[in-house]
Amino acid sequence: QVVPPYGSENQTCRDQEKEYYEPRHRICCSRCPPGTYVSAKCSRSRDTVCATCAENSYNEHWNYLTICQLCRPCDPVMGLEEIAPCTSKRKTQCRCQPGMFCAAWALECTHCELLSDCPPGTEAELKDEVGKGNNHCVPCKAGHFQNTSSPSARCQPHTRCEDQGLVEAAPGTAQSDTTCRNPSESLPPEMSGTMLM
């Protein structure tokens, strides 16, 4: 098995992930593993020398970088919060704070905004990934209601009056629950007509 450094006439290396082509010497050299950087470049007689990233810096990939990237905190002003810390092999992982969605994306989320309210009679469609997009409000399905303007309220099933030993006084809508009454209670005058029919 050939180990770096080795000559390459076609400018390609056997292991693209862990080796790179050095055009000046026309050789393949080792990349440095995640968490390290190149402290001494390779030559025809000596392979790449790697050193560990200093604290608060990282390199995520096999690389031939001469520096490590600086760890950056999640910016709360931009609505971001940390979900996993920066280490020598990985940058800080951020996500939108609860109640927010990613409004600006450049390889990763850079800015979060408040989720829109869903009006009464609707709820936010459930997403695969929290914080990925703004709310898409969908109507409550039959037999359910939601009576507030909220980014997170869910449609609830209408109360079943009979389960509580009551009778229905007014049916539920998408925006209101069923109204129940005691069977012994008389109907209000404006509803007495419907009883006669």
């Epitope: 560990t52 604290e55 996993a84 810390p85 280490t87 020598s88």
Partner: antibody
Framework: EVQLVESGGGLVQPGGSLRLSCAAS????????MSWVRQAPGKGLEWVSG????????NYADSVKGRFTISRDNSKNTLYLQMNSLRAEDTAVYYC??????????????WGQGTMVTVSS | DIVMTQSPDSLAVSLGERATINCKSS????????????LTWYQQKPGQPPKLIIY???TRESGVPDRFSGSGSGTDFTLTISSLQAEDVAVYYC?????????FGQGTKVEIK
């Protein structure tokens, strides 16, 4: 040769204190995070505490928070664990472990032989 | 905290046969930016400290025999010993290092049948 050697274990009464040490050799100590991992008799592994290479970042398992303190002296290549208000459930072999990283959140590539801590009256 | 669950708790395998240990994490430990799973496997022989054998779910630590292999991604992982040897008798632990605190599985004891 890369090596970690723990010391300071022993028998202590509930409520007592103990200070564990871990002497490191064979690598640039200040470049790497270190952790304490414990193993109760016949049980599995439990991460106890970690400290970054410079000593600037520390973290603790909920079970020891407020009672244990991790520290390091990079000039002496030594890691410490100060254990106060010890309980019977702290009885375990305590290992010091090196991370392949300046942050303790990584694979533990080197382990010491461990030191036994017994908390009993 | 991320909970790691191993199965089975113990395993008896004949010499030269395959041993398979599973590890499931309660949360995803795959980091999409570098496509790495932040999961390791350790081997602990009686009376000894644990020894790192696999990191990033599938990369063998130097000096570890190639009969040991790791696979899986996201939340489901496997350690395979392709042909069990007498010196492989040990307890094997998985561990995630995706998020603080790092957490271990409960261990799987591998014995010879």
């Amino acid at each position: 040769e890369v090596q970690l050697v723990e010391s300071g274990g022993g028998l202590v009464q509930p409520g007592g204190s103990l200070r564990l040490s871990c002497a490191a050799s064979g690598f640039t100590f200040s470049s790497y995070a270190m952790s304490w991992v414990r193993q109760a008799p016949g049980k599995g592994l439990e991460w106890v505490s970690g400290i970054s290479g410079s000593g600037g970042r520390t973290n603790y398992a909920d079970s020891v928070k407020g009672r244990f303190t991790i520290s390091r002296d990079n000039s002496k290549n030594t890691l410490y664990l100060q254990m106060n208000s010890l309980r019977a459930e702290d009885t375990a072999v305590y290992y010091c472990a090196k991370s392949d990283n300046w942050h303790y959140l990584d694979a533990f590539d080197i382990w010491g032989q461990g030191t036994m801590v017994t908390v009993s009256s | 905290d991320i909970v790691m669950t191993q199965s089975p708790d113990s395993l008896a395998v004949s010499l030269g046969e395959r041993a398979t240990i599973n590890c499931k994490s309660s949360q995803n430990v795959l980091y999409s930016s570098n496509n790495k799973n932040y999961l390791t496997w350790y081997q602990q022989k009686p009376g000894q400290p644990p020894k790192l054998i696999i990191y990033w779910a599938s990369t063998r630590e130097s000096g570890v025999p190639d009969r040991f292999s790791g696979s899986g991604s996201g939340t489901d992982f496997t350690l395979t010993i392709s042909s069990l040897q007498a010196e492989d008798v040990a307890v094997y632990y998985c561990q995630q290092y995706f998020n603080t605190p790092p957490t271990f599985g409960q261990g799987t004891k591998v014995e010879i049948k």
